[in-house]
């Protein structure tokens, strides 16, 4: 479906005469009749198969035609058609003189015709006007024409119907060729399928309108890419819906059992060390000066006996205070006002004057220490035993009880595992960091060369002079069975043949 449009632009009839040559009185009041029909090689009268249209009187003799409605007519003239435009046409334009107001053909005298033109040719659908001018001996007509498609019709011959829509059945406008062009946010053959929110999971999400992301059961999140864990899952996640995979430190079906109470609750106070010891259970190892299940209680600072030289300790709000005995002073009663004359060194310590007798120093005998030799030495405090040895105080001395594999005063020597000659049958022993290794002689195997393996003593072909070799399996040695004329352990010596006898 489409419209053939004809735009009349100018008509020239300078002499104001009819086709017959007779002049019009008082002038030629001119109107037009248009006939559009199928292509004819020679345009002949007959039915206007594509349609007809008439104009009102547009002017007298010579005039230009305005391109709008004029006296109820229209310019351009419209010749609609309801078929596929064939691409070819024939056009007849007649100019008539109207003596009166009745313009019907039957009301006009036959000689009222001013001029008649006929053209034919090809015409493609398009927006561009084709300009033409037809001249006769007395008149000239300038006009232009085109074919355009009716609303909702598209394509080269206006045969393609496309009506834009934005409803349940589609969301599109029409392209010049009649193809659908989806509105933003829609896709599919008929633009019925919404384009979901960018990134919306293809399987787990869907949408009923553009830029939406609705989640299928078991999925959640803006893009429906997060699974919903099992109902009741406390400290767990999922990789597919309705799972519950426990986070680190949590156990139980619903990951609600705390396997790492220390990390999750930090129950130990005052810098104590926390150790997990089962579900919801922990142990605090307190720093010096603290006690209690959670090391929440501060021990009295006097409990560590900070006052020396017999000073007495008094707890205070901001710490403690040492009451020093006569002859001592300082924060911990560590300074002495005594001299060697006061015999301050205990346990047989020797006193040495210092600072011209204003002070002294005690030289303590073995097993005693302290500024006044008042403390017995615990010789194990410095952990002198190496390689995990246990330190034992033995009166004035100490000794180390070594772990297997170590020896020496301080367990500092590694016992050679090879000292016991553990390799049997002449195997060679090698000391290793974590034990020993035996390299076995031929015929023996096992960790300690204790397994006898049979060897073929005849493999080296020890027998000469075609002797037969036998292996003695009890001793892994060989025996040569000599041919006649040879002796020796390997049949290597020839025997002198006996003399020949005359008989």
């Amino acid at each position: 479906s489409g419209v053939f449009q004809l735009q009349l632009q100018e008509f020239i009839n300078e002499r104001g005469v009819l086709a017959s040559g007779r002049p019009c009185e008082p002038g030629c009041r001119t109107f037009f009749r248009v006939c559009l029909k199928h292509f004819q090689a020679v345009v002949s009268p007959g039915p206007c198969t594509f349609g007809t249209v008439s104009t009102p009187v547009l002017g007298t003799n010579s005039f230009a035609v305005r391109d709008d409605s004029s006296g109820g007519g229209r310019n351009p003239l419209q010749l609609p058609f309801n078929f596929t435009w064939p691409g070819t046409f024939s056009l007849i334009i007649e100019a008539w003189h109207a003596p009166g107001d009745d313009l019907r053909p039957e009301a006009l005298p036959p000689d009222a015709l001013i001029s008649k033109i006929a053209i034919q040719g090809s015409l493609a659908v398009g927006q561009n006007w084709l300009l033409d001018e037809q001249t006769s001996t007395l008149t000239r007509l300038r006009y232009s024409y085109r074919v355009i498609c009716s609303d909702n019709y598209y394509g080269d011959n206006c045969s393609r119907l496309c009506k834009k829509r934005n409803d349940h059945f589609g969301h599109y406008v029409c392209q010049p060729d009649g193809n659908l062009s989806c509105l933003p946010g829609w896709t599919g053959e008929y633009c019925q399928q919404p384009i979901c929110l960018s990134g919306c999971h293809e399987q787990n999400g869907y949408c009923s309108k553009p830029a939406e992301c609705l989640c299928r059961p078991g999925w959640q999140g803006r893009l429906c890419n997060e699974c919903i864990p099992h109902n009741g899952c406390r400290h767990g996640t999922c990789s597919t819906p309705w799972q519950c995979t426990c986070d680190e430190g949590w156990g139980g079906l619903f990951c609600d059992q705390d396997l790492n109470y220390c990390t999750h609750h930090s129950p130990c106070k005052n810098g104590a060390t926390c150790s997990n010891s089962g579900q919801r259970s922990y142990t605090c190892t307190c720093r010096p000066g603290y006690t209690g299940v959670d090391c929440e209680l501060e021990l009295s600072e006097c409990d560590s006996n900070p006052c020396r030289n017999g000073g007495s300790c008094k707890d205070q709000e901001d710490g403690y205070h040492c009451l020093c005995p006569p002859g001592y002073y300082g924060l911990h009663c560590e300074h002495s006002t005594l001299s060697c004359a006061d015999s301050p060194c205990f346990n047989g310590g020797s006193c040495r004057e210092r600072n011209q007798g204003a002070n002294y120093a005690c030289e303590c005998p073995p097993n005693f220490t302290g500024s006044n030799c008042e403390k017995k030495v615990d010789r194990c405090t410095s952990n002198p035993c190496a390689n995990g040895g246990q330190c034992l105080n033995r009166g004035p001395s100490r000794m180390c009880r070594c772990r297997p594999g170590f020896t020496g005063t301080y367990c500092e020597l590694h016992v050679s595992d090879c000292a016991r000659n553990p390799c049997a049958h002449g195997g060679t022993c090698h000391d290793l960091e974590n034990g020993l290794m035996c390299t076995c002689p031929a015929g023996f195997s096992g960790r300690r060369c204790e397994v006898r393996t049979s060897i073929d003593a005849c493999a080296s072909s020890p027998c000469f002079n075609r002797a037969t070799c036998y292996t003695d399996l009890s001793t892994d040695t060989f025996v040569c069975n000599c041919p006649y004329g040879f002796v020796g352990s390997r049949c290597e010596f020839p025997v002198g043949l006996p003399p020949s006898f005359p008989w």
Partner: nanobody, 120 residues
Framework: EVQLVESGGGLVQPGGSLRLSCAAS????????IGWFRQAPGKEPEGISC????????YYTDSVKGRFTISRDNAKNTVYLQMNSLKPEDTAVYYC?????????????TGQGTQVTVSS
């Protein structure tokens, strides 16, 4: 395909006993821990007991300790929940579940459940 099928539920009077079974298929039974949880109408599910793949580790929620016993028979690919001294508050749908690993840590697969009703 992993399948867990519960059976043994029913109606029992307070103080009575029931033995639930969970028959498993579709996986190497000895490799997975198996547990039981229950859900009463309008309430969140509650994990009540679980047994590790070896059977060496079991746990029970406080409300069933001393009354319920979980066990497994690896030869029959079955886990049992022996429920004694049942109370009305034990009424729920009981589900068998596995975390898909050897330890009792989470849920990967569940059965369809079996109804237990404790009522006089």
């Amino acid at each position: 395909e992993v399948q867990l099928v519960e059976s043994g539920g029913g109606l029992v009077q307070p103080g009575g006993s029931l033995r639930l079974s969970c028959a498993a298929s579709g996986f190497t039974f000895d490799d997975y821990a198996i547990g039981w949880f229950r859900q009463a109408p309008g309430k969140e599910p509650e994990g009540i007991s679980c047994i590790s793949s070896s059977g060496g580790i079991t746990y029970y929620t406080d409300s069933v300790k001393g009354r319920f016993t979980i066990s497994r028979d690896n030869a029959k690919n079955t886990v049992y929940l022996q429920m004694n001294s049942l109370k009305p508050e034990d009424t729920a749908v009981y589900y068998c579940a596995t975390p898909g690993i050897a330890a009792c840590r989470g849920i990967h697969y569940t059965g369809q459940g079996t109804q237990v009703t404790v009522s006089s």
